[in-house]
C-alpha cells in the first residue's frame, strides 16, 4: 500500500513539475528591467527565451521574437537546449510511469517489469529536473554577471553610434517557476526510485521443491538422477516422483489429503 502511495505521489509531483517546466520555458518574464524612464514614456521591458516584450506606461504591450541580426547571448541557446531536453525527458518519463503505476493493470505485466519501468521513469524525472534547474541557474548567472549593462559606445561606419540602454536586470517570474518546477520533478523522480525498491520482488536463483510423503503411492522413476545433473531426457525438471515431489506452486494449487505438515 505504501509503495503504491509513494509511486502515485511521485507521479503526481513529477507531473506538476514537468507542467511547471513547460510553463517556465514558454514564459516571457525570464528577466525584467527596472522601470526605465525614457523621456517619451515610462518603459517596462522584459525578456523570455524566445522573445522580448515592452510595456508602456499607457498600458500598450508588444512582444517580438528575437532578431538574430541584433545578436543573442550564446548562453541563451544553451538554456533553451537544457529546458527542451528537460521537457522531452520528462514527457517520456511520464509516459513510462503511467504504464508502471501499480494501480493500473495492463495485461499480465509482472511486478519486476513495473519495477524496472518505475526506476526508468524515476531516473528520467531526476535528469529532467536537473536540466531545468541547470537551465534556470545558467540564465540567472547570466543576469547576475550583466547586472548593470555596459554603456560603452560602439561607433558604426556611418558616423552614428549604438549603445545598450543602461538598465538594471532583475530575475523574472519564470526563473522562480523553473526552479520550483525543476525541484518538484527531481523530488518526484526520487520518490519513483524509492517506490521501485518496494515493487521489485525478491528473486531466488532456484525453484523451491518440497517433498511430501503421500502414503503408499510413492513410485521411483528412473531418470531422477539424470534430471538433477541436467543430462538425459528429463531436462525440464519434471516431477520425478508421482505424488511425492511437487513445486511450491503445485502444492498450493492441488493440496492432497495425504499431505503432512
Amino acid at each position: 500500500m505504501a509503495v503504491t502511495a509513494c509511486q502515485g505521489l511521485g507521479f503526481v509531483v513529477s507531473l506538476i513539475g514537468i507542467a511547471g517546466i513547460i510553463a517556465a520555458t514558454c514564459m516571457d518574464q525570464w528577466s525584467t528591467q527596472d522601470l526605465y524612464n525614457n523621456p517619451v514614456t515610462a518603459v517596462f521591458n522584459y525578456q523570455g527565451l524566445w522573445r522580448s516584450c515592452v510595456r508602456e506606461s499607457s498600458g500598450f504591450t508588444e512582444c517580438r521574437g528575437y532578431f538574430t541580426l541584433l545578436g543573442l547571448p550564446a548562453m541563451l541557446q544553451a538554456v533553451r537546449a537544457l529546458m527542451i531536453v528537460g521537457i522531452v525527458l520528462g514527457a517520456i518519463g511520464l509516459l513510462v510511469s503511467i504504464f508502471a503505476l501499480k494501480c493500473i493493470r495492463i495485461g499480465s505485466m509482472e511486478d519486476s517489469a513495473k519495477a524496472n519501468m518505475t526506476l526508468t521513469s524515476g531516473i528520467m524525472f531526476i535528469v529532467s529536473g536537473l536540466c531545468a534547474i541547470a537551465g534556470v541557474s545558467v540564465f540567472a548567472n547570466m543576469l547576475v554577471t550583466n547586472f548593470w549593462m555596459s554603456t560603452a559606445n560602439m561607433y558604426t561606419g556611418m558616423g552614428g553610434m549604438v549603445q545598450t540602454v543602461q538598465t538594471r536586470y532583475t530575475f523574472g517570474a519564470a526563473l522562480f517557476v523553473g526552479w520550483v518546477a525543476g525541484g518538484l520533478t527531481l523530488i518526484g523522480g526520487v520518490m519513483m526510485c524509492i517506490a521501485c525498491r518496494g515493487l521489485a520482488p525478491e528473486e531466488t536463483n532456484y525453484k523451491a521443491v518440497s517433498y511430501h510423503a503421500s502414503g503408499h503411492s510413492v513410485a521411483y522413476k528412473p531418470g531422477g538422477f539424470k534430471a538433477s545433473t541436467g543430462f538425459g531426457s528429463n531436462t525440464k525438471n519434471k516431477k520425478i516422483y508421482d505424488g511425492g515431489a511437487r513445486t511450491e506452486d503445485e502444492v498450493q494449487s492441488y493440496p492432497s489429503k495425504h499431505d503432512y505438515v
Epitope: V43, V54, F60, E62, F67, L70, V165
Partner: nanobody, 120 residues
Framework: QLQLVESGGGLVQPGGSLRLSCAAS????????MAWYRQAPGKQREFVSG???????NYADSVKGRFTISRDFAKNTVDLQMNSLKPEDTAVYYC??????????????WGQGTQVTVSS
C-alpha cells in the same frame, strides 16, 4: 547594423520653419521608440520630442505647440516639423531609435546629427 541618417537641417530666420527627417536603414527592424534630441554648443544633449509604437507622444516644454513629430512605420522614418523657430533652437539635432522588442539587450541607436541654425 541599424543606421540612422538625418536630413533637412540648415539656416533659417527666426519665426521660420524646417522639417527634419530621419531614416533608419541597414536592418529591417522597426524600433519601439523614436525620438529627436538636440545639443547646443557647450550644453548637454536634451530631449526634444519622441513617439512610441504604442502611440505615446511627448514634447519638451520648450518646444510644445511649435514642433510636431510624426512617424511612418512602413518606411521606418520619423519627421520633426519645426515651426516658429527661435534663436535658442540653434543646435545639432540627433535622431534616436530605441529597440526593446526582438533583442535580448535593449539598444539605443543614434544618428550623426544635422545642424539647425536660427539666425537673422
Amino acid at each position: 547594423q541599424l543606421q540612422l541618417v538625418e536630413s533637412g537641417g540648415g539656416l533659417v530666420q527666426p519665426g521660420g520653419s524646417l522639417r527634419l527627417s530621419c531614416a533608419a536603414s541597414g536592418v529591417d527592424i522597426s524600433s519601439d521608440v523614436m525620438a529627436w534630441y538636440r545639443q547646443a554648443p557647450g550644453k548637454q544633449r536634451e530631449f526634444v520630442s519622441g513617439l512610441t509604437r504604442g502611440g505615446s507622444i511627448n514634447y519638451a516644454d520648450s518646444v510644445k505647440g511649435r514642433f510636431t513629430i510624426s512617424r511612418d512605420f512602413a518606411k521606418n522614418t520619423v519627421d520633426l516639423q519645426m515651426n516658429s523657430l527661435k534663436p535658442e533652437d540653434t543646435a545639432v539635432y540627433y535622431c534616436n531609435a530605441e529597440i526593446y522588442t526582438g533583442t535580448f539587450y535593449p539598444r539605443s541607436y543614434w544618428g550623426q546629427g544635422t545642424q539647425v541654425t536660427v539666425s537673422s
